[in-house]
């Protein structure tokens, strides 16, 4: 059912989410920056090639179709946010060992995403919307080479930022009095 006023979501939860999204965005931007600086070396910058590579590597997108501000379905939207964060935890895990320079940034990003997923889960539990079972991890892309892992890193970081932009817009809309 579409959400009327967002009265069922506490302001403290929404503000916490906005803060966490911005932390992930900041740390994700740091990762992207480092990846882009490797772009020239590894020829990773061409958008068309990246899209094709994304298809061939099977890097999935996380949908937020239940979250449009005009007809937002609260249970569905929170569930999609949580599932999306769960997906990105797996994708970031698949990037492990991408490069020693990127390791610390990737590690921090992974924990940030886990924190945000925890926040969403807590709220779903409080609203009685938490599923009985946690989502299970689908097949993650297997990166066969250092090049694929780096290219995968560019794509995952880019997908994650797009997901966060939509999340941020939804949460900001809900946080408006």
């Amino acid at each position: 059912t579409p959400l009327g006023p967002a009265s069922s979501l506490p302001q403290s939860f929404l503000l916490k989410c906005l803060e966490q999204v911005r932390k992930i965005q900041g740390d994700g931007a740091a990762l992207q920056e480092k990846l882009v600086s490797e772009c020239a070396t590894y020829k990773l910058c061409h958008p068309e090639e990246l899209v094709l590579l994304g298809h061939s590597l099977g890097i999935p997108w996380a949908p937020l179709s239940s979250c449009p501000s005009q007809a937002l379905q609260l249970a569905g939207c929170l569930s999609q946010l949580h599932s999306g964060l769960f997906l990105y935890q797996g994708l970031l895990q698949a990037l492990e060992g991408i490069s020693p320079e990127l390791g610390p940034t990737l590690d921090t990003l992974q924990l940030d995403v886990a924190d945000f997923a925890t926040t969403i889960w807590q709220q779903m539990e409080e609203l009685g919307m938490a599923p009985a079972l946690q989502p299970t991890q689908g097949a993650m892309p297997a990166f066969a080479s250092a090049f694929q892992r780096r290219a995968g890193g560019v794509l995952v970081a880019s997908h994650l930022q797009s997901f966060l932009e939509v999340s941020y817009r939804v949460l900001r809309h809900l946080a408006q009095p």
Partner: antibody
Framework: QVQLQQSGAELARPGASVKMSCKAS????????MHWVKQRPGQDLEWIGY????????NYNQKFKDKATLTADKSSSTAYMQLSSLTSEDSAVYFC???????????WGQGTTLTVSS | DIVMTQAAFSNPVTLGTSASISCRSN???????????LYWYLQKPGQSPQLLIY???NLASGVPDRFSSSGSGTDFTLRISRVEAEDVGVYYC?????????FGAGTKLELK
């Protein structure tokens, strides 16, 4: 209420391995990361690493990478830490701690005391 | 790694008076999202640590409002307005800006 119950004190020989446990109750285990912290007698707290039980992801402080192995059993809501190649430097109290969504450790186990002695 | 620095002991305090404990980090803990990722924990004798303050200035649930915390990106102060006997223990600051998570060496609050 949330509780983290840690296994009892351990006495081990140098070179041996030990595996300690942290049983979580009073909350859904998988959505929360579980962290481990070391405290040597009269000394500060050192973060060892954490496990994310939902995806079985582990991350370690570089200092403990070759020392600690973190695992979790979702069916029993229990986190484990194995310490290998023990030396007297590993004698300490080890705490498990649940990470809350503000990035803080909101619940702590009572600690497991490890004594390494020949 | 971010290094958190604390004095080992506070100035001995009298019950009912105020106390201050300081902490310094070698890197700013202020993130671009406006949050300062600094935390305070208290470890009472023979107990596990307990959370007092999160994100520099927020009081954890159940913590009396005698406790407060402030600071810049790198210099932080925990204040106890009216010290009680139960406040005795070791106070640790910690950072959660980036991995590895790090703690200060702890400051022992002592009574006169």
């Amino acid at each position: 209420q949330v509780q983290l119950q840690q296994s009892g004190a351990e006495l081990a020989r140098p070179g041996a391995s030990v595996k300690m446990s942290c049983k979580a109750s009073g909350y859904t285990f998988t959505p929360y990361t579980m962290h481990w912290v070391k405290q040597r007698p009269g000394q500060d707290l050192e973060w060892i690493g954490y496990i994310n039980p939902s995806i079985n992801y582990t991350n370690y402080n570089q200092k403990f990478k070759d020392k600690a192995t973190l695992t979790a059993d979702k069916s029993s809501s229990t986190a484990y830490m194995q310490l290998s190649s023990l030396t007297s430097e590993d004698s300490a109290v080890y705490f498990c701690a649940r990470r809350g969504s503000y990035g803080n450790f909101d619940y702590w186990g009572q600690g497991t005391t490890l004594t390494v002695s020949s | 790694d971010i290094v958190m620095t604390q004095a080992a002991f506070s100035n001995p305090v009298t019950l009912g008076t105020s106390a201050s404990i300081s902490c310094r980090s070698n890197k700013s803990l202020l993130h671009s999202n406006g949050i300062t990722y600094l935390y305070w924990y208290l470890q009472k004798p023979g107990q596990s640590p307990q959370l007092l303050i999160y994100q520099m200035s927020n009081l954890a649930s159940g913590v009396p409002d005698r406790f407060s915390s402030s600071g810049s990106g790198t210099d932080f102060t925990l204040r106890i307005s009216r010290v009680e006997a139960e406040d005795v223990g070791v106070y640790y600051c910690a950072q959660n800006l980036e991995l590895p998570l790090t703690f200060g060496a702890g400051t022992k609050l002592e009574l006169k």
